[in-house]
């Protein structure tokens, strides 16, 4: 269970891939599209509001083998819209929603080497936000392999 309903902290940051491509958000036909692209030098990076929540549970309850605290994050690039995992379509989408947010909007934060982070679906352990064909997608990572695959690594810069 997530400890409390309010985040322990929030920060505004731009999101980029391990290869320094920017994650951008564009309003098209009344819905938001998410792009992974090289930004022109003078173009300002889109900022995302990251809200961090503590999750506390014994492994027997969670089923994910974690027996203590985890750090969950939600990502909101614009007011009332949050990144959400669509596990059926293996996609990452922006949806307008009210609080309390659905579980699909929560991601377990993993700190990685090179000051990168990864975002694991709360609703589907072992599935991470990743980059596929210049879009964000859900990517299943085999836990027997090293989780360092570059397509699930992201950089946060405030």
């Amino acid at each position: 269970s997530i400890t409390g309903i309010s985040p322990i902290t929030e920060s505004l940051a731009s999101l980029s891939t391990y290869n320094d491509q920017s994650i951008t958000f564009a309003l098209e036909d009344e819905s938001y599209e998410i792009y992974v692209e090289d930004l022109k030098k003078d173009k300002k990076k889109d900022k995302v509001l990251l809200s961090y929540y503590e999750s506390q549970h014994p492994s027997s309850e969670s089923g994910d083998g974690v027996d203590g605290k985890m750090l969950m994050v939600t990502l909101s690039p614009t007011k009332d819209f949050w990144l959400q995992a669509n596990n059926k379509e293996h996609s990452v989408e922006l949806h307008k929603c009210e609080k309390p947010l659905p579980d699909q909007a929560f991601f377990v934060l993993h700190n990685r080497s090179f000051n990168c982070v990864s975002f694991e679906c709360k609703t589907d352990p072992g599935v991470f936000i990743g980059v596929k064909d210049n879009h964000l997608a859900l990517i299943k990572v085999d836990y027997s392999e090293n989780l360092g695959s570059e397509n699930i690594l992201f950089k946060l810069s405030e």
Partner: antibody, heavy 122, light 107 residues
């Protein structure tokens, strides 16, 4: 309960290497990184690096790059820190330490070993 | 690397006093700051994480505040067991770095 049990004190000659072990128990070993922090006599705390026990990836402080190697053995839930080319300034207590949150170091370090004193003297 | 500057380096205080220790980061670290207490011959003990969150089991007389570059640890009413050295640590980016420490001594 969570425990980090470190190997015993070592006395080494300058130029030698030392390998300190840290055996973890009471939690899911591969879900938490393991950090190494040292403290010279009468001095402050100095972060040396971290190993992710899941895949074995490491991050080292620049100061120790090339001299430190962190490894792990998932079958025994043990991490190792080897420091080579020892000099007298490496005389310190070496701690292994586990972050309070799985997968993340953002929430600080809440579990510490008792420390291993490494003395470097000719 | 991010430098963490702690002040004062030592403070003399009496039981019941309010003690404030400050920590400044050389660049912004959001709220990813932890405070530790260390007694001679012992490992550090986590007191505060995420700048202001009290670690489980830590007395409520300890509190933390701040974000960005400036942070504070306050002990509202010093107790005999609080005489120790206190360290701040930025947890935002590798390499993780500690402040130089503040020794709280008996006046």
């Amino acid at each position: 309960q969570v425990q980090l049990v470190q190997s015993g004190a070592e006395v080494k000659k300058p130029g030698a290497s030392v390998k300190v072990s840290c055996k973890a128990s009471g939690y899911t070993f591969i879900s938490y990184g393991m950090h190494w922090v040292r403290q010279a006599p009468g001095q402050g705390l100095e972060w040396m690096g971290e190993i992710n026990p899941h895949g074995g990836s490491t991050s080292y402080a620049q100061k120790f790059q090339g001299r430190v190697t962190m490894t792990r053995d998932t079958s025994t839930s043990t991490v190792y820190m080897e420091l080579s080319s020892l000099r007298s300034e490496d005389t310190a207590v070496y701690y292994c330490a586990r972050p309070s949150a799985a997968y993340s170091h953002y929430l600080g370090i809440d579990m510490w070993g008792r420390g291993t004193l490494v003395t470097v003297s000719s | 690397d991010i430098q963490m500057t702690q002040s004062p380096s030592s403070v003399s205080a009496s039981v019941g006093d309010r003690v404030t220790i400050t920590c400044r980061a050389s660049q912004g670290i959001s709220s990813w700051l932890a405070w530790y207490q260390q007694k001679p011959g012992k490992a550090p003990k986590l007191l505060i994480y995420a700048a202001s969150r009290l670690q489980s089991g830590v007395p409520s007389r300890f509190s933390g505040s701040g974000s960005g570059t400036d942070f504070t640890l306050t002990i509202s009413s010093l107790q005999p067991e609080d005489f120790a050295t206190y360290y701040c640590q930025q947890a935002n980016v590798f390499p993780l770095t500690f402040g130089g420490g503040t020794k709280v001594e008996i006046k």
